[in-house]
Amino acid sequence: MPMFIVNTNVPRASVPDGFLSELTQQLAQATGKPPQYIAVHVVPDQLMAFGGSSEPCALCSLHSIGKIGGAQNRSYSKLLCGLLAERLRISPDRVYINYYDMNAANVGWNNSTFA
């Protein structure tokens, strides 16, 4: 159930159409989870500052049941910062990503939970 959320001050017009599909496929590969369980949410046009500057930036979160940990998170950071730089022109040093290892019982889906 990986769920990736990007809040950014980059305008909607600057988010390419292929971005959501690409994020989905890349996260599926990186987490080893099926693409049909990957959810991505890009929230553009936000009023944001990073280090006191309103240059392009992003505040992100990746929730997953397992597949979260020190080495894995470093790998995800490299992948996701790369995509945010390449597609949204956000410098990697203006990105924060919070990682959440979810308990299956605390994630609802399809009238139940993953527990």
Partner: antibody, heavy 122, light 107 residues
Framework: EVKLEESGGGLVQPGGSMKLSCAAS????????MYWVRQSPEKGLEWVAE??????????YYAESVKGRFTISRDDSKSSVYLQMSSLRAEDTGIYYC?????????????WGAGTTVTVSS | DIQMTQSPASLSASVGETVTITCRAS??????LTWFQQKQGKSPQLLVY???TLAEGVPSSFSGSGSGTQFSLKIISLQPEHFGSYYC?????????FGGGTKLEIK
């Protein structure tokens, strides 16, 4: 008006060097990622080099065919980008275009210069 | 490297006709595709980006479609100013390769 203007082309012998310049105006140059693209009858349109903005550490990238021979650089204070070419070969002959994106609208090559012609021949 | 295969290489059509140019990528490039028009002796001009979004000032007689590996550019009701060469280009990753071009000529 958004404008890019290339200069520095001409005739050069194989093995020689040449420096192309591109002057930009009408947009926030410091935010833009800049590119060189060339065109020849033999190879068609071919991306050559890329230089990112200061926010992205002026990172540079090159086509495999020019790596180690060409160097892209920029001077944000002069709103200019350069392409230093060395060890030139006949296959480097073509029209060299400076291109970029109109920052904040799309990330594609929507701004092009008129091009400058480079001929590598003895 | 991703290869972009454009077809046809050349096309002859009359004013008022509708034509379609296709572009195939050697691997999935999502919607990271642009189309350019180039007139003789001029630099390329952006027509379409993100496979289907018309660039500023481009008339609605042009339309782009496709995603993944198969893309097309359709021009309806051809006008004299539409004749020239057309190129596709992917923006998925370096090198940003172009198609070989389609030369559109007046019949």
């Amino acid at each position: 008006e958004v404008k890019l203007e290339e200069s520095g082309g001409g005739l050069v012998q194989p093995g020689g060097s040449m420096k192309l310049s591109c002057a930009a105006s009408g947009f926030t140059f410091g935010d833009a990622w800049m590119y060189w693209v060339r065109q020849s009858p033999e190879k068609g349109l071919e991306w050559v080099a890329e230089i990112r903005s200061k926010a992205h550490n002026h990172a540079t990238y090159y086509a495999e065919s020019v790596k180690g021979r060409f160097t892209i650089s920029r001077d944000d204070s002069k709103s200019s980008v350069y392409l230093q070419m060395s060890s030139l070969r006949a296959e480097d002959t073509g029209i060299y275009y400076c291109t970029s994106h109109h920052y904040g609208s799309s990330w594609y090559f929507d701004v092009w210069g008129a091009g400058t012609t480079v001929t590598v021949s003895s | 490297d991703i290869q972009m295969t454009q077809s046809p290489a050349s096309l002859s059509a009359s004013v008022g006709e509708t034509v379609t140019i296709t572009c195939r990528a050697s691997e999935n490039i999502y919607s990271y595709l642009t189309w350019f028009q180039q007139k003789q002796g001029k630099s390329p001009q952006l027509l379409v980006y993100d496979a289907k979004t018309l660039a500023e000032g481009v008339p609605s007689s042009f339309s782009g479609s496709g995603s993944g590996t198969q893309f097309s550019l359709k021009i309806i009701s051809l006008q004299p100013e539409h004749f020239g060469s057309y190129y596709c280009q992917h923006h998925y990753g370096r090198p940003y390769t172009f198609g070989g071009g389609t030369k559109l000529e007046i019949k």
